[in-house]
Interface confidence: medium
């Protein structure tokens, strides 16, 4: 969690005098609290925006917005603490709106608004907006929160943005699987224009489980600039195993903007609709000699047509 | 170098529950399936069963009612149970390793070839079923 | 099951015959099939697999062929410390299930 703070933060407004500071999210008021307090935000709302950085980069930010409510309470208003919570890691980050005058009652609603707390794709935040000074001991709450889940990188607005595209995610790989006799899988997929190395996870799991009953990595090397673009085709013979026929198969690229953390595709192949005979067993040999390695398939050929749920 | 060994009751009640632990050192227990094989002097070499590291199992089904094989990752070890005993079950039981990863790479494709066999075995233990 | 037989279920040979060793599956197995030494009193110690791959550290007088249901081990030149039993297990499909094994001993 961070700001956007390539500019001033401004909460001034026509009729009030104001300055956003940094908050440890913890008031002064929570020590000493104060006799009177002013009421809680009203209509709370958080959207999606997007701000360009100086640099040109470009970031998912939370708008914040609230307005007051229409009672003698905002005489008491000296401000507001704004926080951002992550839900999954619990860090927390807080800016303070401190009122440098009186905030007077005038025809129109008292709206404001931030927009500069950053926000990481696929995140869940709880954006919280508390009028200052907080409220004595057993005294009404005068907060106002709300979840806020910013969406993940396939979001078409999210992937340009540069957190999305430092990761990968103008990287479609268009991952087809399909199911080959002779315990065989083919996976296809197409190769981005960077000269890096993928890998391809494959789970296999039986048909109505979750405990996996096969798991392998595989390493593909770095294309050369020629192949950039191309797809690239990986057969990947498995363990013979009655029911063992549900794979996952997912590629992780590691691309030089996110090496170990870019965005993996997967696609997903199903168990074969059971026929009503069984299929006879053919007799299979390699065109080519086996160099390493030990051989062994257990039970039937699981023949399914070719599935492909691809997600990130 | 991967090593297994045996372990367990030498003697065996009939109708009890023979339990043998096979103990995995110099590697990992993940990423293989391990495999329990009896030889009794009647039935020659016989597979019980194996284990996947995740704990998914494959029995043969001539045994299945009576076979529970089990794993233990934090401890590297799998172990066998076979219950309800008679004398047919007197044998020398092994444990065996089963799984080994072989690349083939040619030009912009990519073979990956999975090739299975018993390769590592323990040395065998003997149990006998007698009252 | 798939069944495998082999044969002969003995032989007799001298140090330096070549010796061959067949074994039949009663349906197809590709080529997933390994050979297997075993002495008396130690574990089946696995010498061919992928019915033609030399198992690393075994000497190249061993060699294996086949695919679908018949399959051959052949030892070159027999040595003394050859002299065992010699069984073939096919892994294609559950349950595994080895050969009856064969016998080979000095004549």
């Known amino acids: 969690l961070r700001l956007l703070d390539h500019r001033a933060l401004v909460c001034s407004q026509p009729g009030l005098n104001c300055t956003v500071k940094n908050s440890t999210c913890l008031d002064d008021s929570w020590i000493h609290p104060r006799n009177l307090t002013p009421s809680s935000p009203k209509d709370l709302q958080i959207q999606l925006h997007f701000a360009h950085t100086q640099q040109g980069d470009l970031f998912p930010v939370a708008h914040i917005e609230w307005t007051l409510q229409t009672d003698a309470s905002i005489l008491y208003l000296e401000g507001a603490e704004l926080s951002v919570l992550q839900l999954n890691t619990n860090e927390r980050l807080c800016v303070k709106f401190q009122f440098l005058s009186m905030l007077q009652h005038h025809r129109k609603r008292w709206r404001f608004s931030f927009s500069h707390f950053v926000v990481d794709p696929g995140q869940e935040y709880e954006v919280t907006v508390h009028h200052l000074p907080k409220p004595i001991p057993d005294g009404d709450p005068n907060h106002q929160s709300k979840n806020f889940l910013v969406p993940d990188c396939e979001h078409a607005r999210m992937k340009v943005t540069t957190p999305c595209m430092s990761s990968g995610s103008l990287w479609d790989p268009n991952i087809t699987v399909e199911t080959l006799e002779a315990h065989q899988l083919r996976v296809s997929f197409t190769l981005w224009n960077e000269s890096t190395h993928y890998q391809i996870l494959l789970t296999s799991f039986p048909h109505m489980e979750n405990h996996s009953c096969f798991e392998h990595m595989h390493h593909i090397p770095a294309p050369r600039p020629e192949e950039f673009h191309q797809r690239s085709n990986v057969t990947l013979t498995l363990r013979n195993l009655k029911g063992c026929c549900r794979h996952q198969v997912q590629i992780q690229p590691f691309f030089s903007s996110c090496l170990n953390d870019c965005l993996r595709h997967s696609a997903t192949v199903s168990c074969p609709e059971m026929p009503d005979t069984p299929e006879p067993i053919p007799d299979y040999m390699p065109l080519w000699e086996p160099r390493s390695g030990s051989s062994d398939y257990k039970d039937d050929d699981d023949k399914g047509s070719s599935h492909h749920h691809h997600h990130h | 170098q991967v090593q297994l060994q045996e372990s367990g009751p030498g003697l065996v009640k009939p109708s009890e529950t023979l339990s043998l632990t096979c103990t995995v050192s110099?590697?990992?227990?993940?990423?293989?399936?391990w495999n329990w094989i009896r030889q009794s002097p009647g039935k020659g070499l016989e597979w019980i069963g194996d284990?996947?590291?995740?704990?998914?199992?494959n029995y043969n089904p001539s045994l299945k009612s009576r076979v529970t094989i089990s794993v233990d990752t934090s401890k590297n070890q799998f172990s066998l149970k076979l219950s309800s005993v008679t004398t047919a079950d007197t044998a020398v039981y092994y444990c065996?390793?089963?799984?080994?990863?072989?690349?083939?790479?040619?030009?912009?494709?990519?073979?990956?070839?999975?090739?299975?066999?018993?390769?590592?075995w323990g040395q065998g233990t003997t149990v006998t079923v007698s009252s | 099951d798939i069944l495998m037989t082999q044969s002969p279920s003995s032989l007799s040979a001298s140090v330096g015959d070549r010796v061959t060793i067949t074994c039949r599956a009663s349906q197809g197995i590709r080529n997933d099939l390994g050979w297997y030494q075993q002495k008396p009193g130690k574990a089946p110690k696995r010498l061919i697999y992928?019915?033609?791959s030399l198992q690393s550290g075994v000497p190249s007088r061993f060699s294996g062929s086949g695919s679908g249901t018949e399959f051959t081990l052949t030892i070159s030149s027999l040595q003394p410390e050859d002299f065992a039993t010699y069984y073939c297990l096919q892994h294609n499909s559950n349950p595994f299930t080895f050969g009856p094994g064969t016998k080979v001993d000095i004549k």
């Open positions: 992928a019915a033609s």
């Open positions: 284990i996947y590291y995740s704990g998914s199992t």
């Open positions: 065996a390793r089963d799984g080994e990863l072989a690349n083939y790479y040619g030009s912009g494709s990519y073979q990956f070839y999975y090739y299975y066999g018993m390769d590592v």
């Open positions: 110099g590697g990992s227990i993940s990423n293989y399936y």
